[in-house]
C-alpha cells in the first residue's frame, strides 16, 4: 500500500529528533485510529447510492445542448501550411450523404489532409507513400426501438464499422478487411407501454491499428447501418497517420 | 488532485512548540492523505457488489482484487530525461476528485508528461508547441440498477465522454468539442425480483483521433456521469502524443 | 463485405500483403499481432502471418511482446466477442467479458494493467450478439518490459485478423 514507500532512509534521530519522531508517531497513530473507521463507515454508507443512483442523467443540460448542435458553424480555419509538412496524415469527419448514406468531410471543422493524402467519398482515402500507418475509426450510432412488441426489449440490431483496403494500386480483387468493430444493441421499447417509439439509445463503435499500406492503395469505411449514424460533432470520424 | 489545494499559506512557525505543532500537523495531514484514499479504495475493493466476480465467476478473482485496489503504490519512477526528449506527450490516469468528480493524475503510476506538456485538473492539458496530435481517451463506467420497478430493465442512462479544446490561440469562446463517444446502458433490475439493487454492469467509452493543436490551447475531458466512473487501474485515462 | 460476418475473408488468406521495405525512413520499433484462429480456447498472439508483423527489435516470447528499446510507445489492443441468443426456456445468465493489456517490468512485482475494459452482456432472446472492445494509449516503457493481455470470455472471441489484435509502436 501507499505507506510502504515511506520508510526513512536517513541515520538515527537523536535528542530533539526523538521527540519530533514521538510526536509524529503518536499523531499518526491517533489520526489513523480516527480516520480509518470513519472513512470505512462513510464509504459503506455511500456505496449503495453511489452505484445505484446511476440512472439519473446528471449531465449538464447546457453541455448536452451544445453537443447536440452537431455541425454548428465555428470560425473556419485553414489548417496551417507549416503544420507537419512531411507527414502523411488525415482526419475525416462523418457528414450526411444524400440518400441517408455516410459521407466524409475532409476540410471542414477538425478535418484535414496533409502531405499529399487524397480523399473523396467515392474513392476513399489514398496515402501518398508506402509506409506503416496507424488507422483509426469511430462511428457513433443512435436510434430508438420502433413501436410494438410485447416484450420490454425490441429486436437486436448489430452495428458494424469496418475499414477496408481496395482499389487503386490494391487492384480489383476482393476489398480486404483491415480492422473492424461491432456492437449489438437491444433497444428498450416504450417504457410507458403506449406502443410508441422507445427511448433514444446511443453507442459508439471504434478501433485502430497498424497497417502497412502502399502508395495508391485506398482505404474506406464500410458500415452496416448508415441510417443510424450519429453526425453530432466529434462522434463519427476516421483517419490515418504514418508512423514509420 | 484533491490534495493539491492543501498547501500552507501561513507565515513561518517559530519556537520548539511551533516545530512540534508543525510536525504533528504535517504528520496528521500526510497520514490522512494516505489513509483516507487507501481506506476508501480498500473498502470499495472489498464491498461485494463492487466487483464483477459476484455476477459471474468467469472473472479471475485475483485480477479483480488487484484492479479493485486502484492506486496501490508502485515504485515511483521519474520519467527518464532521455526518453524521446523532443516529443510532447502525456498520459493521464483517472483519479477520484473530492465530491464524486473525475480528476486526473499526471505523475503517478503510468501517468507522465513530457517535453513541456502541462496539466492541471482546473485547466486541462496544455501542449507546448503547434502540431498534429493524436488525442485519446477511455472512460470506464460501472453501476447497478437501483431497487424497484416492475419491468426487468431499469431506466436507460446515456454515458458520454467528450474531449474539448479551449483557451490559448483558440480564444475565450465556447469550448470546441473535438471527439466524443457515447453508450446507452439499460441496467438489468434485481433478477431475483427481491426489489434489491440489480447486478453490476460495466462499460467503457473510448475514442482517439488526430487533431491539429496550437501552443497554449488546452484540452480537457468532460463526462456525463462522474459518479459512475470506474477508477480501477487501466480503465480510465486520456492522453496526447505529438505525431507531426 | 468480406468478413461482414466477422470471419476472415478469402482475400486475406489468398492474397497476403507483401511486406514492404520502408526505404524512405528509418524503421521504428512496431508490432501488430493477431489472435490465432486455430486456437479456440486460448488467445495466442501470432506474428508474421496475414497482416501481423514484428519490426525493428520487437519480439514475441511467451505470448508477450518484448519492448526493444526504452521510449514512449503507443500500445493498443482489440477483441471482439460474440454469442448466441438464449432459448426462451433458459434463464438468461449475464456474461462477464473483459480484456486487459498488462505490463510486466523488472520495476514492479506484478503485472500492471495498462488498458482495461469490462462489459456485462445479457444475451437477448432473438438474435446472436457481438461486442467489441478497443483501447489504446501512450506509455513510457523500458527495454525488456513485457506487454501481455488477459481476457475473460475467451470462448466467445471472434478470432480473425480484423477483429482480435494487439500492437505497439514507438513514437
Amino acid at each position: 500500500m501507499g505507506a510502504l514507500g515511506l520508510e526513512g532512509r536517513g541515520g538515527r534521530l537523536q535528542g530533539r529528533g526523538s521527540l519530533l519522531l514521538a510526536v509524529a508517531g503518536a499523531t499518526s497513530l491517533v489520526t489513523l485510529l480516527l480516520a480509518v473507521p470513519i472513512t470505512v463507515l462513510a464509504v459503506l454508507a455511500l456505496v449503495p447510492q453511489d452505484q445505484g443512483g446511476l440512472v439519473t442523467d446528471t449531465a449538464d443540460p447546457g453541455a448536452q445542448a451544445q453537443q447536440g448542435l452537431g455541425f454548428q458553424k465555428l470560425p473556419e480555419e485553414e489548417p496551417e501550411a507549416d503544420l507537419s509538412p512531411g507527414l502523411p496524415a488525415a482526419h475525416l469527419i462523418g457528414a450526411p450523404l444524400k440518400g441517408q448514406g455516410l459521407g466524409w468531410e475532409a476540410t471542414k471543422e477538425q478535418a484535414f489532409l496533409t502531405s499529399g493524402t487524397q480523399f473523396s467519398d467515392a474513392e476513399g482515402l489514398a496515402l501518398p507513400q508506402d509506409g506503416l500507418y496507424y488507422l483509426y475509426c469511430l462511428v457513433g450510432y443512435r436510434g430508438r426501438a420502433p413501436p410494438g412488441g410485447a416484450e420490454p426489449r425490441g429486436r437486436s440490431v448489430t452495428l458494424r464499422s469496418s475499414l477496408y483496403r481496395a482499389g487503386g494500386a490494391y487492384g480489383p480483387g476482393t476489398p480486404e478487411l483491415l480492422l473492424e468493430g461491432a456492437e449489438t444493441v437491444t433497444p428498450v421499447l416504450d417504457p410507458a407501454g403506449r406502443q410508441g417509439y422507445g427511448p433514444l439509445w446511443y453507442t459508439s463503435v471504434g478501433f485502430g491499428g497498424l497497417v502497412q499500406l502502399r502508395r495508391g492503395e485506398r482505404v474506406y469505411v464500410n458500415i452496416s447501418h448508415p441510417d443510424m449514424v450519429d453526425f453530432a460533432r466529434g462522434k463519427t470520424f476516421f483517419g490515418a497517420v504514418m508512423v514509420g | 488532485m484533491g490534495a493539491l489545494g492543501l498547501e500552507g499559506r501561513g507565515g513561518r512557525l517559530q519556537g520548539r512548540g511551533s516545530l512540534l505543532l508543525a510536525v504533528a500537523g504535517a504528520t496528521s495531514l500526510v497520514t490522512l492523505l494516505l489513509a483516507v484514499p487507501i481506506t476508501v479504495l480498500a473498502v470499495l475493493a472489498l464491498v461485494p457488489q463492487d466487483q464483477g466476480g459476484l455476477v459471474t465467476d468467469t472473472a479471475d478473482p485475483g485480477a479483480q482484487a488487484q484492479q479493485g485496489l486502484g492506486f496501490q503504490k508502485l515504485p515511483e519512477e521519474e520519467p527518464e530525461a532521455d526518453l524521446s526528449p523532443g516529443l510532447p506527450a502525456a498520459h493521464l490516469i483517472g483519479a477520484p476528485l473530492k465530491g464524486q468528480g473525475l480528476g486526473w493524475e499526471a505523475t503517478k503510476e503510468q501517468a507522465f508528461l513530457t517535453s513541456g506538456t502541462q496539466f492541471s485538473d482546473a485547466e486541462g492539458l496544455a501542449l507546448p508547441q503547434d502540431g498534429l496530435y493524436y488525442l485519446y481517451c477511455l472512460v470506464g463506467y460501472r453501476g447497478r440498477a437501483p431497487p424497484g420497478g416492475a419491468e426487468p430493465r431499469g431506466r436507460s442512462v446515456t454515458l458520454r465522454s467528450s474531449l474539448y479544446r479551449a483557451g490559448g490561440a483558440y480564444g475565450p469562446g465556447t469550448p470546441e468539442l473535438l471527439l466524443e463517444g457515447a453508450e446507452t446502458v439499460t441496467p438489468v433490475l434485481d433478477p431475483a425480483g427481491r426489489q434489491g439493487y440489480g447486478p453490476l454492469w460495466y462499460t467503457s467509452v473510448g475514442f482517439g483521433g488526430l487533431v491539429q493543436l496550437r501552443r497554449g490551447e488546452r484540452v480537457y475531458v468532460n463526462i456525463s456521469h462522474p459518479d459512475m466512473v470506474d477508477f480501477a487501474r487501466g480503465k480510465t485515462f486520456f492522453g496526447a502524443v505529438m505525431v507531426g | 463485405l468480406p468478413g461482414v460476418g466477422l470471419t476472415p475473408s478469402a482475400a486475406q488468406t489468398a492474397r497476403q500483403h507483401p511486406k514492404m521495405h520502408l526505404a524512405h525512413s528509418t524503421l521504428k520499433p512496431a508490432a501488430h499481432l493477431i489472435g490465432d484462429p486455430s486456437k479456440q480456447n486460448s488467445l495466442l498472439w501470432r506474428a508474421n502471418t496475414d497482416r501481423a508483423f514484428l519490426q525493428d527489435g520487437f519480439s514475441l516470447s511467451n505470448n508477450s511482446l518484448l519492448v526493444p528499446t526504452s521510449g514512449i510507445y503507443f500500445v493498443y489492443s482489440q477483441v471482439v466477442f460474440s454469442g448466441k441468443a438464449y432459448s426462451p426456456k433458459a434463464t438468461p445468465t449475464p456474461l462477464y467479458l473483459a480484456h486487459e493489456v498488462q505490463l510486466f517490468s523488472s520495476q514492479y512485482p506484478f503485472h500492471v494493467p495498462l488498458l482495461s475494459s469490462q462489459k456485462m452482456v445479457y444475451p437477448g432472446l432473438q438474435e446472436p450478439w457481438l461486442h467489441s472492445m478497443y483501447h489504446g494509449a501512450a506509455f513510457q516503457l523500458t527495454q525488456g518490459d513485457q506487454l501481455s493481455t488477459h481476457t475473460d470470455g475467451i470462448p466467445h472471441l471472434v478470432l480473425s485478423p480484423s477483429t482480435v489484435f494487439f500492437g505497439a509502436f514507438a513514437l
Epitope: L97, G99, G101, L102, Q118, S120, D121, A122, E123, G124, A126, A166, G167, G168, A169, G171, P172, G173, T174, P175, G216, R218, Y220, N222, I223, S224, H225, P226 | - | L1, P2, V4, S9
Partner: antibody, heavy 116, light 107 residues
C-alpha cells in the same frame, strides 16, 4: 465462375421509366461495389454511379443524379438501375460493372431505346 | 470533372506490330488510371489498373505506363484477338470519366 447477367433490351416511350437489372453470381455479392455505365451509339462510356450492396449506400455522377436510381436486392444478388423521365438522349447500352474503382467484370449490356 | 482525351480515335497496325495508345488527363490523376478493352460484340474487359498493373489473366503483351497527366497503353506482338476499342478511365477524382476510345484495326 463470376458472371453479371443483365436483363434484356427495352423499348420505352419518352417520359416513361424503366428498371434494368444485373444478376450477380459466382462471388460474394455484398463484397464488391457495383458500378453502372452507359454508352450511346458510337460514343464513349459514361460512368453513372456506384452502389455498395452491403448497405445500399450509393454515389452518383451529378449528371445522372436525377436520371438514375441505384438499388440492390441482396436476397436475389441482383443490382437494379431505374432510369426516370426518359428522352431520346437516354437511348444507349447500359452496363453494370463490378469493382471499387477498376471494374474487373462487366455485364453484357442492356440496350434501352426511347422512341414514341 | 476531369476530361480524358485519347487523341487517336482509330489506328491500324499489322499482326506482330507494337502499338501504343495514349491518353491525357486535364489534371494530375496520380496514376489512378485504368485501361479497358471493348470487343466489337460489346464485351468489356479490364486490362490494366493503377497505370501499369496487369489484371490477372491478361497477356503480358499488354503494358501501361505514365504519370501526372500523360499515360499510355502498349500492345506488343499484335494478335488478331486484339481487334477492339481501347478506353482509358481515370478513377482519381469523382465522377470517374472515360476517354473517347481508340479503335484498333488490323491492316
Amino acid at each position: 465462375e463470376v458472371q453479371l447477367q443483365q436483363s434484356g433490351p427495352e423499348l420505352v416511350k419518352p417520359g416513361a421509366s424503366v428498371k434494368i437489372s444485373c444478376k450477380a453470381s459466382g462471388y460474394s455479392f455484398t463484397g464488391y461495389f457495383m458500378n453502372w455505365m452507359r454508352q450511346s451509339h458510337g460514343k464513349s462510356l459514361e460512368w453513372i454511379g456506384r452502389i455498395n450492396p452491403y448497405n445500399g449506400d450509393s454515389f452518383y455522377n451529378q449528371k445522372f443524379k436525377d436520371k438514375a436510381t441505384l438499388t440492390v436486392d441482396k436476397s436475389s444478388t441482383t443490382a437494379h438501375m431505374e432510369l426516370l423521365s426518359l428522352t431520346s438522349e437516354d437511348s444507349a447500352v447500359y452496363y453494370c460493372g463490378r469493382g471499387y474503382d477498376a471494374m474487373d467484370y462487366w455485364g453484357q449490356g442492356t440496350s434501352v431505346t426511347v422512341s414514341s | 470533372d476531369i476530361q480524358m482525351t485519347q487523341t487517336t480515335s482509330s489506328l491500324s497496325a499489322s499482326l506482330g506490330d507494337r502499338v501504343t495508345i495514349s491518353c491525357r488527363a486535364s489534371q494530375d490523376i496520380s496514376n489512378f488510371l485504368t485501361w479497358y478493352q471493348q470487343k466489337p460484340d460489346g464485351t468489356v474487359k479490364l486490362l490494366i489498373y493503377y497505370t501499369s498493373k496487369l489484371h490477372s489473366g491478361v497477356p503480358s503483351r499488354f503494358s501501361g505506363s505514365g504519370s501526372g497527366t500523360d499515360y499510355s497503353l502498349t500492345i506488343s506482338n499484335l494478335e488478331p484477338g486484339d481487334i477492339a476499342t481501347y478506353y482509358c478511365q481515370q478513377v482519381s477524382k469523382f465522377p470517374w470519366t472515360f476517354g473517347g476510345g481508340a479503335k484498333l484495326e488490323i491492316k
